[in-house]
């Protein structure tokens, strides 16, 4: 019968040829009376057999990632009779892996959006690298992820590539971060190959800022001839948030005379002071009112940022008009 062990040949051998093993008949007594032949895909071009001994050699560099298995056939013939000594036999040559491929991030570019002020541990995104080496061959394709840039705000789980928040961030201080992740094979051991990817992490706004008046005192004037509903001036607050989180509502906090009202221009986010009742210079030539401003939408969990609404004082001077 045929005698052989399983055949393995390392990929990327830089020698001219490489001895893989021996294939022989147990009837072969070593007197060169038998001739061994190799058949099948790769015979003669990738593998050869020493026809006298049955020794098999790889005669070219192999790439496991291109082809990991060769199925060949062997024959052994008695030179004297020309007859087969053994039935033709099929055998396998496996190409064994070396760590010749670096991890690659295939889904680049990565981009994620996460709310500002998110607590530590919040999941941002998962990055995944793939390695063309054999996952069943040692640690050649076992990857470890690490953070090259992004501390102290982000961390990455070494085995999963999950990026999490490790420190709260304020969008109003910085609204985006570039995080660089490295994937290393060989679980980081010597001889490891690595690949890197960049992740753009944008912070979305939350309503963590209340509107604050630009001025603590506004001076306005109104003619005593002005009809009710007249706009006598504007006041303005600023809010570091954006979008709907910066939408605000102005209102009167204090007006003993109940002469004025404030309406909000939602286009400009300005407060418009309106005359609610006609004024008479001879009766009262100046007024003092207090206005306050609040955000339009404030989720319950963010109310802590919105205690004590900002207020401003408005002094209104009534202008005299000659009367008939």
């Amino acid at each position: 019968g045929w005698v052989w062990n399983q055949f393995f040949v390392p990929e990327e051998m830089n020698t001219t040829s490489h001895h893989i093993g021996q294939l022989r008949s147990d009837l072969d007594n070593g007197n060169n009376s038998f001739q061994y032949k190799l058949l099948g895909a790769g015979a003669g071009s990738t593998f050869i057999i020493d026809e006298r001994t049955g020794d098999i050699y790889a005669i070219q560099k192999l790439d496991r990632e291109e082809r990991s298995l060769y199925i060949l056939r062997a024959q052994v013939i008695d030179i004297a009779t020309g007859r087969a000594v053994e039935p033709e036999s099929e055998f396998v040559i496996k190409v064994s892996d070396i760590n010749d491929n670096e991890p690659k991030f295939l889904d680049e570019p990565y981009e994620a959006i996460v709310p500002e002020m998110s607590p530590e541990g919040t999941l941002v995104i998962q990055v995944t690298a793939s390695d063309a080496d054999d996952p069943s061959s040692g640690n050649n394709a076992r990857l470890l992820y690490s953070l090259l840039q992004g501390q102290p705000y982000f961390s990455v789980e070494p085995t999963t590539g999950v990026i999490r928040i490790s420190s709260k961030m304020d969008r109003e201080l910085q609204d985006e971060y570039w995080v660089i992740i490295q994937a290393k094979d060989m679980i980081g051991q010597p001889g490891a190959l690595s690949g890197t990817t960049s992740v753009l992490i944008k912070l979305s706004d939350v309503n963590d800022n209340k509107p604050i008046f630009k001025e603590s005192l506004y001076r306005l004037t109104v003619s005593e001839s002005a009809p009710t509903g007249t706009s006598i001036g504007t006041i303005m607050a600023y809010d570091n948030d954006i979008g709907e989180n910066a939408e605000m509502d102005y209102s009167i906090e204090e007006d003993d005379s109940q002469t004025f009202d404030i309406i909000t221009n939602h286009e400009t986010q300005e407060g418009i002071v309106i005359l609610k009742k006609k004024v008479d210079f001879e009766h009262q030539n100046h007024y003092g009112i207090r206005a306050k401003v609040k955000n339009h939408h404030v989720p319950e969990q963010l109310m802590k940022y919105h205690t004590e609404a900002s207020t401003t004082f408005i002094k209104i001077q009534v202008e005299d008009v000659d009367e008939p």
Partner: antibody, heavy 121, light 107 residues
């Protein structure tokens, strides 16, 4: 008996081309690697190129890469060396040599008598 | 590229004497070394391959030894037909490389 007979050498001007042939007999040509080796006048041996049996794999010395092409015709049991952009430094006796068996597959066990190539203006 | 260094360049010996030729590889080539003999006006002839295996028809007085980086060709008792130039050659790595040769001449 294994025999190798080179031909095609001669005098050629720099920049010119030449095609060497090596007719083989006495063995199964497609089962063996074949080589070209040269020897400049009064100098040692220099490997030029190798082709595996069947022609699947070819290898070249850096000094000839991109200028020389090795090939074979199994039906004629003949090895070729196409030499282009010839230089004075290519002047040599060119030998073809048969590869061996097994671990000596890329070796040189039988040599032809050589053909002379002279590159000169 | 593997550099093959032969020594001595010339060896002057008498008939019947022992000739010892050395060949050193710049890095390990296992046992993938061959020795060739070349006489003036002739093609090289294979003597030894696999560092120590004699080629067909080579007499027993010719022997090879060594592995890795250090190799030796020994001719135990020089005959008149042994006076020639000897080359070592590695076939472990591409490009295949030859040593510069050792000339064995009659003293």
């Amino acid at each position: 008996e294994v025999q190798l007979l080179e031909s095609g050498g001669g005098l050629v001007q720099p920049g010119g081309s030449l095609r060497l042939s090596c007719a083989a007999s006495g063995f199964t040509f497609s089962s063996y690697a074949m080589n070209w080796v040269r020897q400049a006048p009064g100098k040692g041996l220099e490997w030029v190129s190798t082709i595996s049996g069947g022609g699947a794999n070819t290898y070249y010395a850096d000094s000839v890469k991109g200028r020389f092409t090795i090939s074979s015709d199994n039906s004629k049991s003949t090895l070729y060396l196409q030499m282009n952009s010839l230089r004075a430094a290519d002047t040599a006796v060119y030998y073809c040599a048969k590869g061996g068996m097994g671990g000596y597959y890329y070796g040189m066990d039988v040599w032809g008598q050589g053909t002379t190539v002279t590159v000169s203006s | 590229e593997i550099v093959m260094t032969q020594s001595p360049v010339t060896l002057s010996l008498s008939l019947g004497e022992r000739a010892t030729l050395s060949c050193r590889a710049s890095q390990s080539i296992s046992s993938n070394l061959a020795w060739f003999q070349q006489k003036p006006g002739q093609a090289p002839r294979l003597l030894i391959y696999g560092a120590f295996t004699r080629a067909t028809g080579i007499p027993a007085r010719v022997s090879g030894s060594g592995s890795g980086t250090e190799f030796t060709l020994t001719i135990s008792s020089l005959q008149s037909e042994d006076f020639a130039v000897y080359y070592c050659q590695q076939y472990n790595y591409w490009p295949l490389t030859f040593g510069g040769g050792t000339k064995v001449e009659i003293k």
